[in-house]
Interface confidence: low
Amino acid sequence: LIIGFGISGRHSITVTTVASAGNIGEDGILSCTFEPDIKLSDIVIQWLKEGVLGLVHEFKEGKDELSEQDEMFRGRTAVFADQVIVGNASLRLKNVQLTDAGTYKCYIITSKGKGNANLEYKTGAFSMPEVNVDYNASSETLRCEAPRWFPQPTVVWASQVDQGANFSEVSNTSFELNSENVTMKVVSVLYNVTINNTYSCMIENDIAKATGDIKVTESEIKRRSHLQLLNSKAS
């Protein structure tokens, strides 16, 4: 969490941002909140990005003002116009690109004063893994698949029964480039699995960590997946 204050003494307002990550090809949110004002027409929101000549987005007098918007963001940004009056300056970024990563500033002007806060935005690809029993294999084998990751993640297997065991010798992981030539499909195979055990396939890069669990018993198979972004810090 980053909290910024205006620089002009008593004419300052608190602006708060939260570092976040964008999943390339999908829509993302750059979070920013501020002390609300009673009049929408008195609120100016500017989103800026370090190293970019034009603005990322500007909202003033109750509507978007995009005459100074940089071409790399054209047609891809929007604020939640109905929530600005209650202090939400968050930016929706459509079709997140790898190049959208960087440091952003949420700059706010209201009748109470000015304030700003920076936000670190990471971009990459991350997806939920699914673990299945590979019935085609000659021995008891589990197959963990996740369709989109970038940068290349690490894959680690763990087991509830054999806690702390190193499965690198009995697993094989491959990365297959997807058609857009950026993200990759992750496939990891674990051999010699035992019944009545819970196995976890953990995929992690510097943006996200995802886990796929599978519990195999004589009578049933239970699956569970979980994904966590690693850099959600507020400012």
Partner: antibody, heavy 121, light 107 residues
């Protein structure tokens, strides 16, 4: 140490063309916007053109729009200014400058030594 | 377009004097103003940005002030090395505009 070294200036006839280059070193060139600024003999500074770090966005002063083109080659750490349809009033020392983009707080923190362009018949 | 007007055009002062240069914008520019120093035959050098922030390595005798339409550059104690022309500059996302310059001479 940041260094900017302009070249390509010289004498050219009205209506002619010239290409200025600026070789950059001492910093990650592709991370910075760059600008050209000129100064006519005995006169003040005039901003000419700017380009984003990636080269995707370019901006021009009204006085050169349609005649000058700014570009960059990030693999060679070089900035260019292609000048066409040159006029006598384009005579100036042309400086390349690193254009610090810190969220709209854009300033020129490093400058080259300049290259003189003279447009005369 | 926003116009920047500096005054005076030329200023003559003695070593140790307090010197003030004014820059006026034709409309409000918030704090988007920088000051540069250009010594004879040299490239300009950044002194102040965002109206009052001192660039690193610049002597503390230089200071900037103002917001909106009126800005000042002050040299608290003029030194022989300060002989130069000083320019103010407005900047926004896509344009840069310089004032016409103020030449500072040493008496």
């Amino acid at each position: 140490e940041v260094q900017l070294l302009e070249s390509g200036g010289g004498l050219v006839q009205p209506g002619g063309s010239l290409r200025l280059s600026c070789a950059a070193s001492g910093f990650t060139f592709s991370s910075y916007a760059m600008s050209w600024v000129r100064q006519a003999p005995g006169k003040g500074l005039e901003w000419v053109s700017a380009i984003s770090g990636s080269g995707g966005s370019t901006y021009y002063a009204d006085s050169v729009k349609g005649r000058f083109t700014i570009s960059r080659d990030n693999s060679k750490n070089t900035l260019f200014l292609h000048m066409n349809s040159l006029r006598a009033e384009d005579t100036a020392v042309y400086y390349c400058a690193r254009d610090i983009q810190w969220f709209g707080e854009s300033v020129f923190d490093y400058w080259g030594q300049g290259t003189l362009v003279t447009v005369s018949s | 377009d926003i116009q920047m007007t500096q005054s005076p055009s030329t200023l003559s002062a003695s070593v140790g004097d307090r010197v003030t240069i004014t820059c006026r914008a034709s409309q409000s520019i918030s704090s988007w103003l920088a000051w540069y120093q250009q010594k004879p035959g040299k490239a300009p050098k950044l002194l102040i940005y965002k109206a009052s922030s001192l660039e690193s390595g610049v002597p503390s005798r230089f200071s900037g002030n103002g917001s909106g339409t009126e800005f000042t550059l002050t040299i608290s104690s003029l030194q022989p090395d300060d002989l130069a022309t000083y320019y103010c500059q407005y900047y926004n996302s896509y344009s840069r505009t310089f004032g016409q310059g103020t030449k500072v001479e040493i008496k």
